[in-house]
């Protein structure tokens, strides 16, 4: 993965109550199933419609889950992480890292590679160009007066 991706990273504590069909999301990652280059963390790959996580509304696809009920998810095999979630009980506390991508490049945490967010340069370049055109037109107008 070359290039640079800038993120606005925020952390949040999310408390979920296990629903009839569990926690209502899918996970990827682990030391044996890296989802992100050089990161064996656990990520949310899918939110189940009308599941516990979807009804709560805060957990998003692409979020990194740092801990479950205070237990760190670092350096776990994928299946060990799955078992941790499945045995976490009725009330589950998740420490979650949200990442908002603010500049394009190779996608860091979205495995399927769909760019989320608009690259800054795509906004700045047209704005700068418009400013220059407006300044030039203004100067021409002043010279004619």
């Amino acid at each position: 993965m070359n290039g640079r991706v800038d993120y606005l990273v925020t952390e949040e504590e999310i408390n979920l109550t296990r629903g009839p069909s569990g926690l209502g999301f899918n996970i990827v990652g682990g030391t044996d199933q890296q989802y992100v280059s050089n990161d064996s963390g656990i990520y949310v790959s899918r939110i189940k419609e009308n599941g516990a996580a979807a009804l709560d509304g805060r957990l998003q696809e692409g979020d990194k889950i740092l801990s479950v009920n205070g237990q760190d998810l670092k350096n776990l095999l994928h299946q060990d992480a799955v078992d941790l979630f499945r045995n976490a009980g009725y009330a589950v506390s998740l420490r979650v890292q949200h990442r908002l991508q603010v500049q394009n490049g190779p996608i860091g945490h979205r495995g399927e590679g769909d760019p989320s967010g608009i690259p800054i340069f795509m906004v700045l370049v047209p704005v700068f160009a418009l400013t220059m055109v407006a300044a030039w037109a203004f100067m021409r107008y002043r010279q004619q007066l």
């Epitope: 069909s21 569990g22 926690l23 209502g24 999301f25 899918n26 996970i27 990827v28 044996d32 199933q33 989802y35 949310v44 790959s45 899918r46 189940k48 419609e49 599941g51 994928h78 299946q79 799955v82 979630f85 499945r86 495995g111 399927e112």
Partner: nanobody, 125 residues
Framework: QVQLVESGGGLVQAGDSLRLSCAAS????????MAWFRQAPGKERDFVAT????????NYADSVKGRFTISRDNAKNTVTLQMNSLQPEDTAVYYC???????????????????WGQGTQVTVS
Amino acid sequence: QVQLVESGGGLVQAGDSLRLSCAASGITFRWYTMAWFRQAPGKERDFVATINWSGSDTNYADSVKGRFTISRDNAKNTVTLQMNSLQPEDTAVYYCAGVPGTSLSGETDPRDYDYWGQGTQVTVS
């Protein structure tokens, strides 16, 4: 573009065997939970079998346990369903399905899967 393409269906006699294959493209296959479902005429789509990302964990519908075997090859992006001792009640269109990651909800509901193949017809006479 995600594509799941099934093959291997056909017309067989009761007691015969058949091997269905599903070739996946457009996804990072090794991250996906894969499954087979089937739909008989006039009936709902039913769960047949599922397999986790590494192939180490499988789950089967009671009606096919001991007769059907699901497997996967992550190097070739394929999932297969070996069907033995086929019975007339196994007649259906068989669908391959996939979803990213491991579910913490369940894997037997068609709504748990995002991607589907077009299906392959299996007829047991």
